[in-house]
């Protein structure tokens, strides 16, 4: 399995972001396909579970991503993307996308470095 991501993503605080992860595999996509998304915070704290897909999508039942993430992928199109809602500054960090598609061997885990930036306020825009 080979994984492709946007590598770097910038999004505005309070908005939603699509974390894009696509993959290729010599094995046909079927019920054995699994996708696991995790998060490594900027402060070096423990990795956190974000999302899981196996036949159906499954949100985490606990933690900071509970009720804030949804499946936006399409396995038939080799797409394992997710949507992260209501971005917060502490969502800054690295998101990893791991795709397993037996009998294909596991590939390198895809990474996206998310930067959550301030909303640009009208008062901050200066006209020359």
């Amino acid at each position: 399995v080979e994984i492709y991501t946007s590598r770097v993503l910038e999004a505005v605080n309070g908005t939603d972001a699509r974390l894009k992860c696509t993959f290729s595999s010599f094995a046909p996509v079927g019920d054995a396909l699994t996708v696991t998304w995790n998060f490594r915070p900027l402060d070096g704290g423990p990795e956190q579970f974000v999302f899981y897909y196996h036949i159906d999508p499954f949100q985490p039942m606990s933690g900071r991503f509970k009720d804030r993430v949804s499946w936006d992928g399409n396995p038939e199109r080799y797409d394992a993307s997710i949507l992260l809602w209501k971005l917060q500054f502490d969502d800054n960090g690295t998101y990893t996308c791991q795709v397993k598609n037996p009998p294909d061997v596991d590939g390198v885990i895809g990474e996206i470095r998310l930067s959550v930036v301030h909303t640009v306020r009208f008062s901050e825009i200066h006209f020359l």
């Epitope: 699994t34 402060d43 423990p46 990795e47 606990s62």
Partner: antibody, heavy 116, light 106 residues
Amino acid sequence: QVQLVQSGAEVKKPGASVKVSCKASGYTFTNYWMHWVRQAPGQGLEWMGEINPTNGGTDYNEKFQGRVTMTVDKSTSTAYMELSSLRSEDTAVYYCTIYTTALDYWGQGTLVTVSS
Amino acid sequence: DIQLTQSPSFLSASVGDRVTITCRASSSVGYMYWYQQKPGKAPKPLIYVTSNLASGVPSRFSGSGSGTEYTLTISSLQPEDFATYYCQQWSSNPPTFGQGTKLEIK
């Protein structure tokens, strides 16, 4: 490294309450939800509930609803679990644990003995 | 609440053996966790979301399954693997644990 240090063993009478503390270090306290799991002697594991340290929001196992209260003190990175109306079947080791990719980090456990 | 039933409850095996523990759920669950516990110690995570190895766990441990049936496999038992193993579901609240499988030295 992540550490969860719990308060010491307690002996309580039936009908009393117990408050167990769990002091966290080695990570950003508000970034990970704290859970409480108990284990009666020689028995399996039982999830009691969780608390979001950022806002104090809780989700309790219905079995303990009305008897359990989970709180946090962000200033000291400490979580608390109070169980009231104790009965003999509440005798157990109580663990605090944080959810990361699983319940990855656990306190050493606090033995609570309920005996008349 | 979803009930998890592990089989077997007790298992005797020798160093080098391949061992499989099964966890059956009373209704379909999306994924499974597995923990190892030694006497007097807190549980230690082995597998998260069905098949992912927790940090620092040796590759002789593996997990698989879907729906109502999940398995933990130890490909070649080592002396330090003799312990009690628990499955845990968390695709519906409250999270629940299996009753445990005690793995003993034959």
